[in-house]
Interface confidence: low
């Protein structure tokens, strides 16, 4: 999946299986990523687990679990708030669109989380205070916390190299290792589809093009669009909303704030 | 143990906003508390040792004494809860300040710096 980190780095990761997205004293978020097509390096999020840890007079431990085709509007125990403590309503889950869009507000840690199902896969977005982001017991063990550190270099897909190939007249086989992708989805069509929803040619737009060329699944256009929309709602600095690629000096680590 | 059901029914019956009951609401509030107490008694056998259950029982006793509610008296009819418009606070009036990050943060310093992380697509 594509990852925008807390430090506004933008990466395309091929991480497969379960990976920690956030792991701090208050909150644990884990995603499970699966290959989008047989033989493809590209993966998308098929499962998401959020654990809100027990906190003072505010909330009991609450677990939220979403999977493909199952986006619940309640925590695993059936509740919609933080439990039975005085401040239980400082954690609240709201269904925005049934089966498609859920928002979780954790006021006790100043955090808002948006989970969506777009097509077959899940998207995740969070707004969190720096103080909460950095509230970790043991800094040394936080190496693979994706939202903070990003993906390991060997798990990143070189977005720009892919794009350079895709822009050439014939699409190389490497761009799409799976025969399932329809040959009738040329680069120009992908660009047109993405331009419709994402008029600014930023990294969300580039991600959209990459996804369409890799999978042929137009739902990924919406995934990029909603990721940007959620960013508009959740990012505190509107000037940094659109990310643009750096020059070619940084292989594998595409991005940073404009 | 159906304590969560008792809790949610009580909150539904009493969440008319973020304020404590006004003096003319007290009879209604006491009736809701008595209903809450009745609900906890009905589920008592299956809730032995459940911390949420014992917290509720203590909480009811505290609220009954705070609002001078008599143990005997009318109970409230369960009512369908109408959700407040989006953006309205549904936080209980006794929610500690520590459970509202921004409120407790502003006491000590300027507004917090927020960060954003997102994951999408392939």
């Amino acid at each position: 999946p594509h990852l925008r980190t807390f430090t506004d780095h933008f990466q395309t990761c091929k991480v497969q299986g379960a990976w920690p997205l956030i792991d701090n004293n208050y909150l644990n978020v884990q995603v499970t990523n699966t290959p989008v097509l047989p033989g493809s390096a590209a993966t998308a999020t098929s499962k998401l687990t959020i654990i809100f840890k027990n906190f003072q007079e505010c909330v009991d431990q609450k677990v939220y679990q979403a999977e493909m085709d199952e986006l619940p509007s309640a925590f695993a125990d059936g509740s919609k708030n933080g439990g039975d403590k005085h401040g239980a309503n400082s954690l609240k889950i709201t269904e925005k669109v049934s089966g498609q869009h859920v928002e979780i507000q954790a006021k006790y840690i100043g955090t808002t989380i948006v989970v969506r199902q777009v097509g077959r896969y899940l998207t995740f977005a969070v707004r969190m205070p720096e103080e909460v982001v950095n509230a970790v017991e043991d800094r040394d063990s936080q190496g693979l916390y994706l939202c903070l550190r990003g993906c390991p270099l060997n798990q990143q897909i070189d977005f720009q190299a892919f794009r350079a190939n895709a822009e050439s007249p014939r699409r190389p086989a490497a761009a799409s290792p799976s025969p399932v992708v329809p040959e009738t989805f040329p680069y120009e069509t992908a660009v047109a589809k993405c331009k419709e929803k994402l008029p600014v040619e930023d990294l969300y737009y580039q991600a959209c093009v990459f996804d369409l060329l890799t999978t042929g699944d137009v739902n990924f256009t919406l995934a990029a669009y909603y990721a940007l929309e959620d960013g508009k709602m959740l990012h505190s600095n509107k000037d940094k909303l659109h990310l643009f690629e750096r020059t070619r000096e940084l292989p594998g680590a595409v991005a940073a704030a404009a | 143990c159906k304590i969560l059901k008792c809790n949610s029914e009580f909150w539904s019956a009493t969440s008319s906003g973020s304020h404590a009951p006004a003096s003319d609401d007290v009879p209604e509030f006491c009736a809701a508390l008595r209903t809450y107490a009745l609900c906890t008694r009905r589920t008592a056998r299956t809730c032995r040792g459940d911390l949420a259950y014992h917290s509720a029982v203590h909480g009811i006793e505290d609220l009954m004494s705070q609002h001078n509610c008599s143990k005997d008296g009318p109970t409230s009819q369960p009512r369908v809860r109408t959700l407040p418009p989006a953006g309205d606070s549904q936080e209980r009036s006794d929610s500690p300040e520590i459970c509202h990050y921004e409120k407790s943060f502003h006491k000590h310093s300027a507004a917090p710096n927020y960060t954003h992380c997102g994951l999408f697509g392939d």
């Epitope: 840890k53 003072q56 007079e57 009991d60 695993a76 005085h86 | 911390l51 917290s55």
Partner: antibody, heavy 120, light 109 residues
Framework: EVQLVQSGAEVKKPGASVKVSCKAS????????ISWVRQAPGQGLDWMGW????????NYAQKLQGRVTMTTDTSTSTAYMELSSLRSEDTAVYYC?????????????WGQGTLVTVSS | QSALTQPRSVSGSPGQSVTISCTGT?????????VSWYQQHPGKAPKLMLY???KRPSGVPDRFSGSKSGNTASLTISGLQAEDEADYYC?????????FGGGTKVTVL
Amino acid sequence: EVQLVQSGAEVKKPGASVKVSCKASGYTFTSHGISWVRQAPGQGLDWMGWISPYSGNTNYAQKLQGRVTMTTDTSTSTAYMELSSLRSEDTAVYYCARVGSGPYYYMDVWGQGTLVTVSS
Amino acid sequence: QSALTQPRSVSGSPGQSVTISCTGTSSSVGDSIYVSWYQQHPGKAPKLMLYDVTKRPSGVPDRFSGSKSGNTASLTISGLQAEDEADYYCYSYAGTDTLFGGGTKVTVL
């Protein structure tokens, strides 16, 4: 250094009450809960309950309901556990422990223990 | 009767590995990230060894590790040393007030 220092050993008669104190230092007292745990001679650990110094909220073990009272004094950063109607089976070492983040979370700092002997 | 079941005793020679299990229910162990482990030497207060199933507080040697599978949490001591001989207790919140396991005596042969 984070420390919990408990009051000294007590000998009580059946039917009496005992009040054990636990003085905290080295951290913000109201930021963590205090749990009380006891251990009868040769037996395992037995959770008695929890108190939040921040709000005074308590959770007591079912079997001790009505006999145990936990309180705190934030001005002196001290937690208290009072057990009434003592019986011989209450003979135990009583520990206070700081709770990491909430009532049921891990106990990261422990007091040295207070031996309470109930004997006629 | 404890809601968390531990073996009464385990033993091993110095340098060997031993594993202590702690079996509960789905709510007490299976779905919980709050399993912690305590070491207690005779006549001493318990000491936190692991929390959140796998995390080690500073000062605890890395030969102590934790894991969880289904409704069973485990504490493993690899490279057993003489000073590891003690009682070990697991602890978890289960929605009830029986939170400690019965304890396991670890003997270093």
